[in-house]
């Protein structure tokens, strides 16, 4: 009589998963842009701000063509995890000045967490190497002053914006290879 009927499709195809990951990344990029603008309005940035503990930008847009799927997803997940930790740290130790960025900062943290979960699921479905989602990391030192917290916020939101912009381009490119 032939094989029994198989199960219905229970979850999205990895390509559809990649589509929804791009949408989520775009939405997070818009949130970050808005929050960074809000921060600049309240506390104008005097030049570029850096934070040594932040990841360096993964890749220039021009070098995207040479990327392979595992490398992009692994690097993206590692960088976003670092930014998630920094956002958590900012909310916890950033001082009273940064309380004005709530609840938006909390929403950003939740969406970042959701994007990380989505990337983990995608890597699992593709059976790509999966480094630990929560590797142990040294604790971040609290800002030395209120202004230090504000400078850190500028650096974190600026870096996250660049990383997400890179992520959208990278994920769209990878979709053509899947």
């Amino acid at each position: 009589p032939g094989p029994p009927p198989g199960p219905p499709r229970v979850s999205p195809d990895p390509r559809a998963e990649l589509d929804s990951t791009v949408l989520l990344t775009r939405s997070l990029l818009a949130d970050t842009r808005q929050l960074a603008a809000q921060l600049r309005d309240k506390f104008p940035a005097d030049g570029d701000h850096n934070l040594d503990s932040l990841p360096t930008l993964a890749m220039s847009a021009g070098a995207l063509g040479a990327l392979q799927l595992p490398g992009v997803l692994t690097r993206l997940r590692a960088d976003l995890l670092s930014y998630l930790r920094h956002v958590q740290w900012l909310r916890r130790a950033g001082g009273s000045s940064l309380k004005t960025l709530e609840p938006e900062l909390g929403t950003l943290q939740a969406r970042l967490d959701r994007l990380l979960r989505r990337l983990q699921l995608l890597m699992s479905r593709l059976a790509l190497p999966q480094p630990p989602p929560d590797p142990p990391a040294p604790p971040l030192a609290p800002p030395s002053s209120a202004w230090g917290g504000i400078r850190a916020a500028h650096a974190i939101l600026g870096g996250l914006h660049l990383t997400l912009d890179w992520a959208v381009r990278g994920l769209l490119l990878l979709k053509t290879r899947l």
């Epitope: 979960r117 790509l128 190497p129």
Partner: antibody, heavy 114, light 111 residues
């Protein structure tokens, strides 16, 4: 609808070889990592091996490392498991599964006995 | 000896709520990997019940829910029905094995 159909199981003597196949349909096979998972009679599930969507990454459980080889042919929508140096403890129903795994076949029985 | 630890059996009466636990270690659940749950009805292949700790695939009733905390996870079944009688397995990726690991399974009996 999704279908995974295993074949190639049967009775084999200790030290012998078998090649299992899994024919996939109803989904984009080349976009999914694929697993082999086994279940000894009356026992729980044991992961055996996984291969990435494009075949570039392959991992094995310690119990089968060096004896089993996983491979796939995306042009034929087929997954394979080459099993050599079979032992009595390899006796089990072998399932092929896709993704997390999200989808499972019905399994094929491999019996290793003299 | 399974890498993830589940109670071998659980039981409940129709309509009741039952919970099945799954305990791992720092190389799997504790490392942040997602937990997935499978249901295996007698004589059939396993079926995905919960993925990514608490997500339900389409077609799975909302009586089934999952959660994860630290190195443990749990599956809750509310409004227990006779057709829920099955074996339930948890699974998670393990970075020391480079593959998924399963719990030993929990046989659920509906009294």
């Amino acid at each position: 609808e999704v279908q995974l159909l295993e074949s190639g199981g049967g009775l084999v003597q200790p030290g012998g070889s078998l090649r299992l196949s899994c024919a996939a349909s109803g989904f984009t096979f080349s976009s999914y990592g694929m697993h082999w998972v086994r279940q000894a009679p009356g026992k729980g599930l044991e992961w055996v091996s996984v291969i990435s969507y494009d075949g570039s990454y392959k991992y094995y459980a310690d119990s089968v490392k060096g004896r089993f080889t996983i491979s796939r042919d995306n042009s034929k929508n087929t997954l394979y498991l080459q099993m050599n140096s079979l032992r009595a403890e390899d006796t089990a129903v072998y399932y092929c599964a896709a993704g997390v795994p999200d989808y499972w076949g019905q399994g094929t029985l491999v019996t290793v006995s003299s | 000896q399974s890498v993830l630890t589940q109670p071998p059996s659980a039981s409940g009466t129709p309509g009741q709520r039952v919970t099945i636990s799954c305990t791992g270690s720092s190389s799997n659940i504790g490392a942040g990997y997602d937990v997935h749950w499978y249901q295996q009805l007698p004589g059939t292949a396993p079926k995905l019940l919960i993925y990514s700790n608490n997500e339900r695939p389409s077609g799975v009733p909302d009586r089934f829910s999952g959660s994860k905390s630290g190195t443990s996870a749990s599956l809750a079944i509310s409004g227990l029905r006779s057709e829920d009688e099955a074996d339930y397995y948890c699974a998670a990726w393990d970075n020391s094995l480079n593959g998924p690991v399963f719990g030993g399974g929990t046989k659920l009996t509906v009294l």
